[in-house]
Interface confidence: low
């Protein structure tokens, strides 16, 4: 829908800084496909850790680590010429303003690590 | 910092539906260290496409799209033995609600794809 | 913010040992792979050793392997380089860095290893 015309951008400098939030998520099951097991047939693998934190929304956050070093060959072996690196994004997430559990929060940055890819390295490893 | 006891948890059935969020983001700049080229470097690249939306906070969210079907082997030439997938995660962005500038959100996923993995296929091409 | 601060280099002996210690904050070194650099003068940087602390994969180069030892502890977020044996060579600034990758890189300032009779 266009934004209705003379609503600031809620980027814009003169937007209100303080907002109503509606927690009933729109498209809850949005990801209704089943969960994908990339993470063990990439050739560079992961492992999901789960990180929680009861005072942020979602409290629940599932964390990629690479298992390797390398990445993993056509014959299982881990190749040291590539390297497996986490591809980050960051995501916002509701932080609970510590105000005696009055219903204020906090927009907040959070870094995540999503899964792994294999990349050529710049600088390879000394032999 | 702990929970205050007897605060609901924002996931809980009694949390209030709607809350005051505070759009001053704390970590802003989380992410300090310079883009990654990753994109460029994987066995499995991709291309960044800019999915804007005025109506949405953030406005502006960069998705992958793999540029190959198969992945990119030593020589540079694209195996089709191996699959290029896209990393995907569920993200909460704000949409805004449609109430004539009033400054009510309410909380949306969404489906991003955030770059891309090379992965063994569970059915190979035929040779 | 993101932070790694390198500590524990110094003057020592052909054959001594030193401990470095790095210690990160503004993320969990558990998250990520971990690692030593090191720079001698008028020389390109090199990968020293890294820690992957999931499945204990380590990488270690072979000017210094049996030597030197990498090691995590999560729980205070700082990763070590226990360095036995030491040889002239090995002089240069140590540096602590996320070792995944040699090129999108979270660095630390550098502490000066220096061997020397």
């Known amino acids: 829908s266009p934004q209705n015309p003379g609503c600031p951008n809620a980027e814009d400098k003169n937007f209100p800084r303080t907002v109503m939030v509606n927690l009933n998520i729109r498209n809850r099951n949005t990801n209704s496909k089943r969960a994908s097991d990339y993470y063990n047939r990439s050739s560079s693998p992961w492992n999901l850790h789960r990180n929680e934190d009861p005072e942020r929304y979602p409290s629940v956050i599932w964390e990629a680590k690479c298992r390797h070093l390398g990445c993993v060959d056509a014959d299982g072996n881990v190749d040291y010429h590539m390297n497996s690196v986490p591809i980050q994004q960051e995501i916002l997430v509701l932080r609970r303003e510590p105000r005696h559990c009055t219903n204020s929060f906090r927009l907040e940055k959070m870094l995540v690590s999503v899964g792994c890819t294999c990349v050529t390295p710049i600088v390879r490893h000394v032999a | 910092s702990p929970q205050n006891p007897g605060c609901p948890n924002a996931e809980d059935k009694n949390f209030p539906r709607t809350v005051m969020v505070n759009l001053n983001i704390r970590n802003r700049n989380t992410n300090s260290k310079r883009a990654s080229d990753y994109y460029n470097r994987s066995s499995s690249p991709w291309n960044l496409h800019r999915n804007e939306d005025p109506e949405r906070y953030p406005s502006v969210i960069w998705e992958a799209k793999c540029r190959h079907l198969g992945c990119v082997d030593a020589d540079g030439n694209v195996d089709y033995h191996m699959n290029s997938v896209p990393i995907q995660q569920e993200i909460l962005v704000l949409r805004r609600e449609p109430r004539h500038c009033t400054n009510s959100f309410r909380l949306e996923k969404m489906l991003v794809s955030v770059g891309c993995t090379c992965v063994t296929p569970i059915v190979r091409h035929v040779a | 913010e993101v932070q790694l601060v390198e500590s524990g280099g110094g003057l020592v002996q052909p054959g001594g040992s030193l401990r470095l210690s790095c210690a990160a904050s503004g993320f969990t070194l558990g998250y990520y792979a971990i690692g030593w650099f090191r720079q001698a003068p008028g020389k390109e940087r090199e990968g020293v050793s890294c820690d992957s602390s999931s499945d204990g994969d380590t990488y270690y180069a072979n000017s210094v392997k049996g030597r030197f030892t990498i090691s995590t502890d999560n729980g205070k977020n700082t990763v070590y380089l226990q360095m036995n044996s030491l040889k002239p060579e090995d002089t240069a600034v140590y540096y602590c860095?996320?070792?995944?990758?040699?090129?999108?890189?979270?660095w630390g300032q550098g502490t000066q290893v220096t061997v020397s009779s």
């Open positions: 860095a996320t070792c995944t990758d040699w090129n999108y890189d979270y």
